[in-house]
């Protein structure tokens, strides 16, 4: 996908539907490409990306890529078509409403990637599946 400031005209009259017959329209995703991040050793992080974009195509989903090497940590947020690999990996969790990070093997760095299909779902990246900010009990713990 291309970011909104260089988007080309798109005029595709085909209505895209999911497996249940529900209409799929372009979703909103955080879209800051690659930025330095302070997210490290946390169960979940916010992207700190202020740019929420309409994806170019209805089939695209939100993606987040977290990378750590000897020098820095980066977080990449984009829209991407799950039929196509991203960073040479298949987006296997594209239908998930949450962005649950999964580690991928990349030489010389720690590499996590997630994808998801609800609006701006790559704003909240989750490294631990049991961690869920929608859990009211957990919110009580946080705000006490």
């Amino acid at each position: 996908t291309i970011p909104p400031h260089v988007q080309k005209s798109v005029n595709n009259d085909m209505i895209v539907t999911d497996n249940n017959g529900a209409v799929k329209f372009p979703q909103l995703c955080k879209f800051c490409d690659v930025r330095f991040s302070t997210c490290d050793n946390q169960k979940s992080c916010m992207s700190n990306c202020s740019i929420t974009s309409i994806c170019e195509k209805p089939q695209e989903v939100c993606v987040a890529v977290w990378r750590k090497n000897d020098e820095n940590i980066t977080l990449e947020t984009v829209c991407h078509d799950p039929k196509l690999p991203y960073h040479d990996f298949i987006l296997e969790d594209a239908a998930s409403p949450k962005c649950i990070m999964k580690e991928k093997k990349k030489p010389g760095e720690t590499f996590f990637m997630c994808s998801c299909s609800s609006d701006a779902c790559n704003d909240n990246i989750i490294f631990s599946e049991e961690y869920n900010t929608s859990n009211p009990d957990l919110l009580l713990v946080i705000f006490q």
């Epitope: 909104p4 329209f25 909103l28 929420t52 609006d119 900010t133």
Partner: antibody, heavy 116, light 107 residues
């Protein structure tokens, strides 16, 4: 087919309350940010507020003109968006549209008239 | 809040004319600018998003351009069904604000 159907518009006195509903169908409602936009008679469009998805905490944003008086909520099990309007003023008189945030899906609108 | 100013507020044109509407933001909004068309008694319809991307199903006579603070909606050859009110909206920051509208009338 995506459908958004608003209801609950009425004539109400200043200071009164009203709750609008928007029944959504034809798409995965729980995955979408949803907004309310209003239009006073003969005037332009004004964004009222939005509710984000429940998985992102269901947080809300409001226009300054309605903050503290209006509350937007959603019930994903019923595919329904709500707008609770309290302390209504005459300047809240408008057609209220339910929309999928920043996408081209709007309801037909429901008229709210605030008058004594 | 970001203020959006459209000009002109109204214009008269004939079928076949080239029509240009401008929208200015009070601060830079990159390319986060949408254009809507509204006909009397109807909900608005999205024409252009991200300043220049044509919404699915919208005729190619509509085009958008600009970035930063200055944006343009162009109708290359006005058709009878294009007589309506047009609104710009920024989606760069919350609240997403609309311009005051431009009414395109028949000359």
């Amino acid at each position: 087919e995506v459908q958004l159907v608003e209801s609950g518009g009425d004539l109400v006195k200043p200071g009164g309350s009203l709750r609008l509903s928007c029944a959504a169908s034809g798409f995965t409602f729980s995955n979408a940010w949803m907004s309310w936009v209003r239009q006073a008679p003969g005037k332009g469009l004004e964004w009222v507020g939005r509710v984000k998805t429940t998985v992102s905490g269901g947080t809300t944003d409001y226009a300054a003109a309605v903050k503290g008086r209006f509350t937007i909520s959603r019930d994903d099990s019923k595919n329904t968006l709500y707008l609770q309007m309290n302390s209504l003023k005459t300047e809240d008189t408008a057609i209220y549209y339910c929309t999928i945030d920043l996408r081209d899906y709007w309801g037909q609108g429901t008229l709210v008239t605030v008058s004594s | 809040d970001i203020q959006m100013t459209q000009s002109p507020s109204s214009l008269s044109a004939s079928v076949g004319d080239r029509v240009t509407i401008t929208c200015r933001a009070s601060q830079s909004i990159s390319s986060y600018l949408n254009w809507y068309q509204q006909k009397p008694g109807k909900a608005p319809k999205l024409l252009i998003y991200a300043a220049s991307s044509l919404q699915s199903g919208v005729p190619s006579r509509f085009s958008g351009s600009g970035s930063g603070t200055d944006f343009t909606l162009t109708i290359s050859s006005l058709q009878p069904e294009d007589f309506a009110t047009y609104y710009c909206q920024q989606s760069y920051s919350t609240p997403p604000t609309f311009g005051q509208g431009t009414k395109v009338e028949i000359k």
